[in-house]
């Protein structure tokens, strides 16, 4: 008969926890040294020998006594039933052809989990499972007592299973859901008694694959390959996961430290291609991805380092820094960024090697700048350095433009007062911090003589007191470095205070919109001025310089306010610099209905008539220009006077109005009145917006005909 | 008769430690997850840590995993917690209960521990 | 962290009345909430879980309702035995938490 090679000293242990039946064996037969492919075929019987569940051909190589291993996975829980395992052997080698043949099976080995429970009355089964989710589960009862019935539920839900003998019911769970993170709830209690027993089975969200894994080296001797995890598993503790770095050319590998990130070393051999799969793995399954790349392709530079900002001019400043080598060959690319005031104003792009330099020109004086470096590898760009920054101050120049001046003349005693006016110049044109002002007054009646003030900034103005003669007065703006060019205004000795009728202009949203004639001489240009706070004794003059060909201009200003009349003066700008006044307008940037009434006088009272008198009072004050008033009279008599309509007061009371058009009439005969009649009368401004306050009537009652007798 | 009884409370200084201990009987106590919960007047009921079956999974509050441990001999039916570095605001009435799941269908009669120096 | 917030905190009602308490979860618990009672100077005992299953003995004048947020207890024909702090806890998130408990007195 020929040699049976058989499986022998089969063992069969329990992993009750991963529901797992760990078999054993070995085959004694062989010859020493002996190594043959052999088949075993596995069979798995449940409650009883001859309901085989599973059956499975496993094939290894097999040497003489060694110990061979296979585990089994039951999808039901150990516990919920008896298995019973047998095997048998075959060779299947192409060295002993005679020998293909199977071996006699071995007696069945019992696994009985269920008479090691205790003599509780009911058990459920698995304990502490863990699945993910849309796994099928199987559970099940042991019960103690035949008499008893149990129902069991999921999550409070009574769940219909099938009874596999009368001690044991099963139940399968389909496509089992993530509920929370404490696990899902299962109880089975009896009808009789008290007993009652849970359990958690555990269920996890899907593992997902890593995404966004990419490598990247900062100085070729280390790669740092960082990857985003795939989305919490949704358990507290059950479900730890790990995660390892292959790299295929060299056959290394590393388990990973951190769950987002891991670094690599370099090989010294110039390795320059790269083949990784990040592997992710937790107690229920492995993902992977992959990553091929060449090294000198993932190169992310480190910052700049040794950045200065050299030779600061008023105008220019270089830059010099240094790179970190990446590679003996390796040319850099470096971008250059100049910010004034928060914005990019100047962008370079540089090829550097060690060290990189860049002159920064067409600056302006006396300006903060902030100026940054990064670098990336030219040859095959990846990703740009941190950018490395300098904050450098340019030098002061001398102020580039002329202060704006302007004047206001007064005749005082046979003196001429000359208010002088500079606006200070914008950082632009100061170049520097203005430390004073230089005023030179030159007598045109004596040119030799001239005066110089000095006036220490930041005065905006000064006061002059001068002579009848005609004078040329030089401002000039003075910082550390140097003097500003002079602007230049002329005083003659005629104030030039000419009488000029006054125009009256609407404003808008948008401001005044002043225009006047041009002029026939030469004009050098022309100057709008106006008080931002009319009736304030510090006024707060304002003036625009416009030019020659100019005829028309817009003043807005924040200060403008409704209701407030605002005054405009119109100046041409002589070739001597004298100005002179071309034109007053006057006007509101938004009229308002008057803000109180005129105080009337009666008199010239007779029976059938009265006169009513007002003073004139300041137009100036008025919120808006008075085109006219309205005079209310109540009588008894149920019809208006002629000249007179009906009005509805907003008291709802009804009188008589008459409507006196004409701003610069000051009296008012109220006529066709009735003897010994009793009136009432009221009188109110109004402008183009409407009427003033409704204020309280005046009583009145004409005398009879004969009281004069 | 289903009975837990907890032993071990004592007053202790600051920075102390204790172990409590909490003995089961009348049921298969390695059927059973079981917990510490404590009881003090300010702040009422807080769970403190739970253990699995055969004491493989542990959970804790997280502000007491440092401190605390909590461990079963399912030989002796017997949950412990062992507490170190005690603080004034451990003081309380500590429970030892029973959960089928994560809710506590049994409970001791509670055992106090006094933090003071 | 999930709170758990009862109302009323405290409640007097006469025998054969019915009582509800409230008890408001600051995040989704689903249904795992269990409800204990807790006499004078004994430990708490369990009246209901999973948000509306009766603990075993626990008699049917006890009813739970609700999930997601919304958790009520209702004792109906009140009796004087009923007297003790009552407590909500969930269990769908660790850390397990409990409400601040409701005291109910009989009248």
């Known amino acids: 008969e020929p040699l049976s090679l058989a499986p022998e000293s089969l063992e069969v242990s329990i992993d009750s926890a991963r529901q797992c039946l760990h078999l054993k064996w070995s085959v004694h037969n062989l010859a020493y040294h002996q190594e043959l492919k052999m088949v075993f075929q596995i069979e798995i019987s449940r409650i009883k020998t001859s309901n085989v569940i599973w059956v499975e051909n496993y094939s290894t190589t097999v040497k003489r006594n060694q110990v061979l291993r296979w585990s089994w996975e039951s999808k039901l829980p150990l516990e919920c039933a008896k298995h019973s395992v047998r095997m048998r052997g075959a060779v299947d080698d192409a060295q002993v052809p005679e020998l293909r043949f199977w071996s006699n099976w071995t007696s069945w080995e019992e696994v009985d989990v269920q008479s090691s429970l205790g003599h509780d009355p009911l058990f459920v089964f698995p304990k502490d499972k863990l699945v993910e989710e849309g796994s099928n589960v199987t559970i099940c009862y042991v019960s103690r007592s035949h008499q008893n019935n149990i129902s069991c539920y999921l999550e409070g839900v009574r769940m219909h299973g099938e009874q596999l003998d009368p001690n044991v019911c099963v139940f399968h769970l389909k496509n089992v859901p993530f509920i929370r993170e404490t696990g899902t709830n299962i109880y089975c209690k009896a009808d009789q008694g008290d007993v009652i027993k849970g359990i958690v089975l555990f269920v996890s969200k899907v593992f997902e694959e890593p995404k966004d894994f990419s490598c990247e080296t900062r100085d070729l001797k280390t790669l740092n390959c960082t990857w985003a995890p795939g989305s919490d598993a949704g358990l507290l503790t059950q479900l730890s996961q790990s995660y390892t770095l292959f790299e295929s050319f060299s056959g290394k590998k590393t388990l990973c430290k951190y769950k987002s990130w891991c670094n690599w070393q370099v090989s010294p051999d110039s390795q320059e291609m790269y083949n990784f799969t990040l592997t992710a793995e937790n107690y229920l399954r492995k993902r992977s991805v992959h990553l091929l790349f060449n090294l000198t392709h993932r190169v992310h530079p480190m910052a700049p380092f040794n950045v200065f900002v050299k030779n600061v001019s008023a105008t220019n400043a270089t830059m010099t820094w240094k790179v970190h080598s990446i590679g003996n060959y390796s040319t850099l690319l470096c971008q250059i960024e100049l910010y004034g005031e928060g914005k990019v104003i100047q962008k370079q792009n540089v090829s550097v090697k060690v060290n990189g330099k860049h002159l920064m020109k067409k600056l302006e004086p006396s300006t903060e700048y902030a100026a940054q470096v990064r670098c990336a590898n030219a040859n095959h760009f990846w990703k740009w350095s941190e950018w490395t920054r300098r904050n450098f101050t340019t030098a002061e120049a001398a102020p580039s433009e002329a202060p704006d001046v302007w004047r206001n003349v007064k005749s005082v005693q046979g003196h001429c007062v000359v208010t002088l006016f500079w606006k200070p110049l914008s950082k632009l044109q100061a170049n520097g911090k203005i430390l004073f002002y230089n005023v030179v007054l030159e007598n045109l009646d004596r040119p030799s003589t001239l005066k110089l003030l000095s006036i220490p900034a930041p005065a905006n103005g000064t006061e002059l007191t001068l002579d009848r003669c005609s004078y040329q007065i030089h401002v000039t703006a003075n910082n550390s470095v140097g003097t500003s060019p002079a602007s230049v205004i002329a005083v003659s000795g005629d104030p030039g205070n000419k009488e000029v009728e006054e125009e009256r202009v609407k404003g808008t949203e948008d401001g005044f919109c002043l225009s006047w004639k041009p002029q026939p001489g030469d004009v050098t240009g022309y100057v709008v001025e106006w008080c931002e706070r009319p009736g304030d004794p510090l006024c707060d003059l304002q003036w625009k310089n416009l030019g020659p060909n100019t005829t028309s201009t817009v003043v807005s200003s924040d200060a403008f306010r409704p209701g407030v009349r605002y005054n405009f003066r119109i100046y041409g700008i002589s070739t001597e610099r004298i100005p002179y006044l071309l034109e007053k307008k006057t006007g509101y940037s938004q009229e308002l209905v008057p803000s109180d009434n005129p105080q009337v006088l009666m008199s010239n009272l007779t029976s059938y008539s009265f006169t009513l008198s007002w003073k004139d009072y300041a137009a100036e004050s008025q919120p808006g220009f008075v085109q006219g008033y309205s005079l209310y009279l109540k009588s008894k008599a149920a019809r208006c006077l002629p000249g007179s309509e009906k009005a509805v007061l907003s008291d709802d009371s009804i009188c008589c109005k008459y409507k006196i058009d004409n701003p610069k009439q000051k009296t008012f005969v109220v006529e066709n009145l009735q003897p010994a009649s009793f009136y009432e009368f009221f009188l109110t401004p109004y402008t183009s917006v409407g009427e003033g306050p409704q204020g309280a009537f005046t009583k009145v009652t004409t005398p009879d005909e004969y009281s004069h007798i | 008769e289903v009975q837990l009884v907890e032993s071990g409370g004592d007053l202790v200084k600051p920075a102390g430690s204790l172990t409590l201990s909490c003995l089961a009987s009348?049921?298969?106590?390695?059927?059973?997850?079981m917990a510490w919960v404590r009881q003090t007047p300010e702040k009422g009921l807080q769970w403190v840590a739970n253990?699995?079956?055969?004491?493989?999974?542990?959970y804790y509050l997280d502000s007491l995993k440092s401190r605390f441990t909590i461990s079963r001999d399912n030989a002796k039916n017997t949950l412990y917690l062992q507490m170190n570095s005690l603080r004034d605001e451990d003081t309380a009435v500590y429970y030892c209960?029973?959960?089928?799941?994560?809710?506590?269908?049994?409970w001791g009669q509670g055992t106090l521990v006094t933090v003071s120096s | 962290d999930i709170v758990m917030t009862q109302t009323p905190l405290s409640l007097s009602v006469s025998p054969g009345e019915t009582a509800s308490i409230s008890c408001k979860a600051s995040?989704?618990?689903?249904?795992?909430v269990a409800w204990f009672r807790q006499k004078p100077g004994q430990s708490p005992q369990r009246l209901i879980y999973?948000?509306?299953t009766r603990h075993t003995g626990v008699p049917d004048r006890f009813s739970g309702s609700g999930s997601g947020t919304d958790f009520t207890l209702r004792i109906s024909r009140v009796e004087a035995d009923d007297t003790g702090v009552y407590y909500c806890?969930?269990?769908?998130?660790?850390?397990?938490?409990f409400g601040q408990g409701t005291k109910v007195e009989i009248k």
């Open positions: 209960a029973r959960g089928l799941t994560w809710d506590f269908d049994v």
């Open positions: 253990i699995n079956y055969d004491g493989s999974s542990t």
């Open positions: 995040q989704d618990v689903d249904t795992a």
């Open positions: 009348g049921f298969t106590f390695s059927d059973y997850y």
């Open positions: 806890q969930q269990y769908s998130r660790f850390p397990l938490t």
């Open positions: 999973l948000a509306s």
